[in-house]
């Protein structure tokens, strides 16, 4: 019968010929009366056999990631008679793995959106690298993730690639972050190969800023001939938030005379001071009113940022009109 051990050949061997093992018949007494032959894909080009001894050699550099095993056939013939000594047999040569592939992130570019002021531990995104080396061969394809850029705001779970928030972020200070993640094989041991990827993390706005008046004091004038409903001027607040989180409503906080009103122009986000009652210069020619501004939409959990509404004082001077 045939005698052999399992055949392995390391990939990426640089030698011109590498001894893999020996195929022989147990009838072979070593007197060179048998001839061994190799058949099948790779025979003669990738692998050769010593016809006399049955020693098999790899004569080409192999890449396990391209082909991890070869199925060949062996024959042994009695030189004297030309007959097969053993029935033709199939055998396998396995290409064994070396760590010659770095981890690669296949789904890049990565981009994630997370609300500003999210608490520590909030999941942002999971990045995954793959390694073409053999996962069953040692640690060649066992990966560890680490953060190269993004501290102290982000952290990455070493074995899963899950990125989490590690420190609260304020969109109004910085609205996006580039995080660089490294994946290292060999679980980070010497000889490890690595790959990196960038993750763009954008902060979405939450309503964590209240509107604040641009001026703490305004001066407006109104003619005593102005009819009720007249717009006598505008006031303006600013809000560092964006979109609907910056929409605001103006109102009167204090007007003993009940002469004025404020309406909100929701397109310009300005407050328009309106004459509610006609004024009479001879009766009163100086008014002072206090206006306040609040956001239109404030979720309950964000009320802590909106405890005291911003106010402004408006001095209104009545202009005299000569009466007939």
């Amino acid at each position: 019968g045939w005698v052999w051990n399992q055949f392995f050949v390391p990939e990426e061997m640089n030698t011109t010929s590498h001894h893999i093992g020996q195929l022989r018949s147990d009838l072979d007494n070593g007197n060179n009366s048998f001839q061994y032959k190799l058949l099948g894909a790779g025979a003669g080009s990738t692998f050769i056999i010593d016809e006399r001894t049955g020693d098999i050699y790899a004569i080409q550099k192999l890449d396990r990631e391209e082909r991890s095993l070869y199925i060949l056939r062996a024959q042994v013939i009695d030189i004297a008679t030309g007959r097969a000594v053993e029935p033709e047999s199939e055998f396998v040569i396995k290409v064994s793995d070396i760590n010659d592939n770095e981890p690669k992130f296949l789904d890049e570019p990565y981009e994630a959106i997370v609300p500003e002021m999210s608490p520590e531990g909030t999941l942002v995104i999971q990045v995954t690298a793959s390694d073409a080396d053999d996962p069953s061969s040692g640690n060649n394809a066992r990966l560890l993730y680490s953060l190269l850029q993004g501290q102290p705001y982000f952290s990455v779970e070493p074995t899963t690639g899950v990125i989490r928030i590690s420190s609260k972020m304020d969109r109004e200070l910085q609205d996006e972050y580039w995080v660089i993640i490294q994946a290292k094989d060999m679980i980070g041991q010497p000889g490890a190969l690595s790959g990196t990827t960038s993750v763009l993390i954008k902060l979405s706005d939450v309503n964590d800023n209240k509107p604040i008046f641009k001026e703490s004091l305004y001066r407006l004038t109104v003619s005593e001939s102005a009819p009720t409903g007249t717009s006598i001027g505008t006031i303006m607040a600013y809000d560092n938030d964006i979109g609907e989180n910056a929409e605001m409503d103006y109102s009167i906080e204090e007007d003993d005379s009940q002469t004025f009103d404020i309406i909100t122009n929701h397109e310009t986000q300005e407050g328009i001071v309106i004459l509610k009652k006609k004024v009479d210069f001879e009766h009163q020619n100086h008014y002072g009113i206090r206006a306040k501004v609040k956001n239109h939409h404030v979720p309950e959990q964000l009320m802590k940022y909106h405890t005291e509404a911003s106010t402004t004082f408006i001095k209104i001077q009545v202009e005299d009109v000569d009466e007939p």
Partner: antibody, heavy 120, light 107 residues
Framework: QVQLQESGPGLVKPSETLSLTCTVS??????????WSWIRQPPGKGLEWIGY???????YYNPSLKSRVTISVDTSKNQFSLKLSSVTAADTAVYYC????????????WGQGTLVTVSS | EIVLTQSPGTLSLSPGERATLSCRAS???????LAWYQQKPGQAPRLLIY???SRATGIPDRFSGSGSGTDFTLTISRLEPEDFAVYYC????????FGQGTKVDIK
């Protein structure tokens, strides 16, 4: 802290024009929303408001003095001025410049005052 | 114009006593448009109260203002030696007018 300082002649002849200047420091006369006033106080008597000006040049005067008063502003010098024409002895007083408040038309900041005597 | 009448003309009190000064307007004014000032000899008036109960910066809480309509009051809860001075009320709704003053002197 806003400070105001009156300056001008301490003696004016009857029928002439009294001229005073108020120099503002520690703040801009062009600050939005503030009015700059002149107020006087005859010796041993009460206070009388003369008029005010806004940095844009818009002025408003006490109706009883309106025909004789002009208040002007020079934003480049951070100053405003009072001119009172055709003075008589009744115009003898300590003249104060003042700025109104951030929450109303009351007088929050005052100069220390300058005595102007009308006499020949 | 709105005439403000202060009473009494002179108030003679001792340190530690309570002072109540009155200011009456010739017609109704909003309480938001009244102020009180203190003046010592040779000095400019100093704002005490405005609107009519807000204390100006640096004014001790023994000073308080109240009132509405035509009757307004300045109260000094416990007179200190430095409180002896002349006090003026002022309205700033219809032009600007001052009361004639109340002198608080040491009894």
């Amino acid at each position: 802290q806003v400070q105001l300082q009156e300056s001008g002649p301490g003696l004016v002849k009857p029928s002439e024009t009294l001229s005073l200047t108020c120099t503002v420091s520690g703040g801009s006369i062009s600050s939005s929303g503030y009015y700059w006033s002149w107020i006087r106080q005859p010796p041993g008597k009460g206070l009388e408001w003369i008029g005010y000006i806004y940095y844009t040049g818009s002025a408003y005067y006490n109706p009883s003095l309106k025909s004789r008063v002009t208040i002007s502003v020079d934003t480049s010098k951070n100053q405003f001025s009072l001119k009172l024409s055709s003075v008589t002895a009744a115009d003898t007083a300590v003249y104060y410049c003042a700025r109104d408040g951030s929450s109303g038309w009351y007088f929050q900041y005052w100069g220390q005052g300058t005595l102007v005597t009308v006499s020949s | 114009e709105i005439v403000l009448t202060q009473s009494p003309g002179t108030l003679s009190l001792s340190p530690g006593e309570r002072a109540t000064l009155s200011c009456r307007a010739s017609r109704q004014i909003s309480s938001s448009y009244l102020a009180w000032y203190q003046q010592k000899p040779g000095q400019a008036p100093r704002l005490l109260i405005y609107g009519p109960s807000s204390r100006a910066t640096g004014i001790p809480d023994r000073f308080s203002g109240s009132g509405s309509g035509t009757d307004f009051t300045l109260t000094i809860s416990r007179l200190e030696p430095e409180d002896f001075a002349v006090y003026y009320c002022q309205q700033y709704g219809s032009s600007f007018t001052f009361g004639q003053g109340t002198k608080v002197d040491i009894k």
